[in-house]
Interface confidence: medium
């Protein structure tokens, strides 16, 4: 019979022959022959391969370097890499999470829309009309202006996105 030019899924062509790929978590030791199956071996303790493969070496698990503020979010297996995240108070600088930076603060006039996590920075939003923030914070939202009416007072100074309104007593009309 004619030697194959293409192989089925999870197979590879070598020496005019279709051999089985090694399953995830295993590496190739020797190709199949006319008489023997592909020989595979499990990856070592701190290694992995995440696809059907013909790799002769497994990949090393990622190291979450505590000196860069990293910690293990999910321990690697023979089939998956280790996932790193940042220590509390810090977040990843990239999707690969190779280092961490401190969460940023929202400036006055802006409030926190979403508190930062290990993988995302603080999300700030401008304080809309009726709200203000006079602080620099990674935690505080915009606060509503004080309602002078509910205190039986009147607005003496309008609020801004950075300042609260100033309330004062109502002018009494003399009889």
């Amino acid at each position: 019979p004619e030697p194959p030019t293409a192989c089925r899924e999870k197979q590879y062509l070598i020496n005019s022959q279709c051999c089985s790929l090694c399953q995830p978590g295993q590496k190739l030791v020797s190709d199949c022959t006319e008489f023997t199956e592909t020989e595979c071996l499990p990856c070592g303790e701190s290694e992995f391969l995440d696809t059907w493969n013909r790799e002769t070496h497994c990949h090393q698990h990622k190291y979450c370097d505590p000196n860069l503020g990293l910690r293990v979010q999910q321990k690697g297996t023979s089939e998956t890499d280790t996932i790193c995240t940042c220590e509390e108070g810090w977040h990843c600088t990239s999707e690969a999470c190779e280092s961490c930076v401190l969460h940023r603060s929202c400036s006055p006039g802006f409030g926190v829309k979403q508190i930062a996590t290990g993988v995302s920075d603080t999300i700030c939003e401008p304080c809309p009309v009726g709200f203000f923030s006079n602080v620099s914070s990674a935690f505080e939202k915009c606060h509503p202006w004080t309602s002078c009416e509910t205190k039986d007072l009147v607005v003496q100074q309008a609020g801004t996105n950075k300042t609260d309104v100033v309330c004062g007593p109502q002018d009494r009309l003399r009889a």
Epitope: T93, V101, L102, H103, S105, V135, S136, S137, F139, E140
Partner: nanobody, 119 residues
Framework: EVQLLESGGGLVQPGGSLRLSCAAS????????MIWVRQAPGKGLEWVSA????????YYADSVKGRFTISRDNSKNTLYLQMNSLRAEDTAVYYC????????????RGQGTLVTVSS
């Protein structure tokens, strides 16, 4: 000029307590979050705790939760860290810091105060 000056460090036995202080000047202290970070010998910086400008929001790393308490006195421009049930692994230089507006490491941090937990 922004200045942060830590004090209160020292040698303490495991299980003991210390209270760190940080005197701030050169900026409007009451309008900023403040944080404590620490650096153990040969290690990187570790975030310890944070407090919101008015002191109502406090946040802690898992490693110190339930043992450390952060507080502030805006009338005195001072930040505090009460450390109880101290462990050997708490040994480090402790810094108070003003967090960044952008993604730099810190806007400012102090010179630090050394806490040594040993019997």
């Amino acid at each position: 000029e922004v200045q942060l000056l830590e004090s209160g460090g020292g040698l303490v036995q495991p299980g003991g307590s210390l209270r760190l202080s940080c005197a701030a000047s050169g900026f409007t202290f009451s309008t900023y979050d403040m944080i404590w970070v620490r650096q153990a010998p040969g290690k990187g910086l570790e975030w310890v705790s944070a407090i919101s400008p008015n002191g109502t929001g406090t946040y802690y790393a898992d490693s110190v939760k339930g043992r450390f308490t952060i507080s502030r006195d805006n009338s005195k421009n001072t930040l505090y860290l009460q450390m109880n049930s101290l462990r050997a692994e708490d040994t480090a230089v402790y810094y108070c810091a003003k967090p960044p507006q952008v993604n730099t490491e810190f806007d400012y941090r102090g010179q630090g105060t050394l806490v040594t937990v040993s019997s």
